[in-house]
């Protein structure tokens, strides 16, 4: 399967969104930066097959979008932003399920590695946790923000590296 | 490869303006916050400022308010310093670094050559 | 501002010594503390960051310990390489400020 360009496209869009969310500065949020533990190792993409590290990119966004999806992000970030913002990731969660249907028979190991989701789902839950501890707090919504723009990012490198695998 | 490349010495006289350049290179420059640092000869490190070169967001420290500006240009991964009008009292070399922002990551891991501004009448 | 005090301000030590350099905050800055180490003419370079993670790179001898308001940078074999300026900078709140610096010669 061919992640189409337009995939690509929306990624940057994410991100672009992303960039554009910040509602307060950045610099009065230093002392609330936290290792989330993002799990490099399964965005390396070395030790997967495709439909696999299709599976996981998918995961991710799928996360993310819970993530901006409950009322306490909706009372954060500003509504036409986050509108678009769900918009691209739904694109992306098309995009790759269409991937993974193609992949069906092509390949004798696994859709799925379920270690690999487990661990993009705990990571989840670590940053779901951080949001809780810090009372949903302006800053630490921005340290999130941060980080998950950092792991769209990695994550593009992987995406990147499954279209050169053509 | 990870780089920070800033412009050349400067030698101005009092009352002159100047801007001075990091360049980065090797690594997203929007993903990382670019901080200036001041040594003023023989003395010690000197915090100045920080710039987020993704939306050009700049915070100084009190003893540099006014007194300098911090800026970016993303389109060439670029970010300055400059004065409008020096004082002696400004000769110094001066540093830039790159900061991770709010990401769990080493700060000021990646730090420029260094740029020596001397100002003398 | 956060002040950040170093001592000592200089010290002789001999290839092979243990030297231990103390920082003291003067407010609580959980583990948010660099040690960078600065040769003459050159710019520093980060050795420790987040108070007690070794940057990529630097040698095992180096390491950092400490919490809220006392840090202390180690170097349990000196080599001759290590003589330099070494300088704490906490990055809990901006203005984002160093210590004064600590010189280690030879002695």
């Known amino acids: 399967c061919d992640l189409p360009q337009t995939h690509s496209l929306s990624n940057r869009r994410t991100l672009m969104i992303m960039a554009q969310m910040g509602r307060i500065s950045p610099f009065s949020c230093l002392k609330d930066r936290h290792d989330f533990g993002f799990p490099q190792e399964e965005f390396d993409g070395n030790q997967f097959q495709k439909a696999q590290a299709i599976s996981v990119l998918h995961e991710m966004i799928q996360q993310t979008f819970n993530l901006f999806s409950t009322k306490d992000s909706s009372a954060t970030w500003d509504e036409t932003l986050l509108d678009k913002f769900y918009t691209e990731l739904y694109q992306q969660l098309n995009d790759l399920e269409a991937c993974m249907m193609q992949e069906v028979g092509v390949e004798d190991t696994p859709l799925m590695n379920v270690d690999s989701i487990l661990t993009v789902r705990k990571y989840f839950q670590r940053i779901t946790l951080y949001l809780t501890e810090k009372k949903y707090s302006p800053c630490a919504w921005e340290v999130v923000r941060a980080e998950i723009m950092r792991s769209f990012s990695l994550s593009a490198n992987l995406q990147e590296r499954l279209r050169r695998k053509e | 490869e990870v780089q920070l490349v800033q412009s050349g010495a400067e030698v101005k006289k009092p009352g002159e303006s100047l801007k001075i350049s990091c360049k980065g290179s090797?690594?997203?420059?929007?993903?990382?916050?670019i901080g200036w640092v001041r040594q003023m000869p023989g003395k010690g490190l000197e915090w100045m400022g920080i710039?987020?070169?993704?939306?050009?967001?700049?915070a100084y420290s009190p003893s540099f308010q006014g007194q300098v500006t911090i800026s970016a240009d993303k389109s060439i991964s670029t970010a300055y310093l400059q004065w409008s009008s020096l004082k002696a009292s400004d000769t110094a070399m001066y540093y830039c670094?790159?900061?991770?922002?709010?990401?769990?990551?080493?700060?000021?891991?990646?730090w420029g050559q260094g740029t020596l501004v001397t100002v003398s009448s | 501002d956060i002040q950040m005090t170093q001592s000592p301000s200089s010290l002789s030590a001999s290839v092979g010594d243990r030297v231990t350099i103390t920082c003291r905050a003067s407010q609580s800055i959980d583990d948010f503390l660099n040690w960078y180490q600065q040769k003459p003419g050159k710019a520093p370079k980060l050795l420790i960051y987040f108070a007690s993670s070794l940057q990529s790179g630097v040698p095992s001898r180096f390491s950092g310990s400490g919490s809220g308001t006392d840090f202390t940078l180690t170097i349990s074999s000196l080599q001759p390489e290590d003589f330099a300026t070494y300088y704490c900078q906490q990055s809990h709140t901006l203005p984002l400020t160093f210590g004064q610096g600590t010189k280690v010669e030879i002695k």
């Open positions: 670094a790159r900061h991770p922002g709010l990401n769990w990551a080493p700060d000021f891991d990646y």
């Open positions: 710039i987020d070169p993704s939306d050009s967001d700049t």
């Open positions: 090797g690594y997203s420059f929007t993903s990382y916050w």
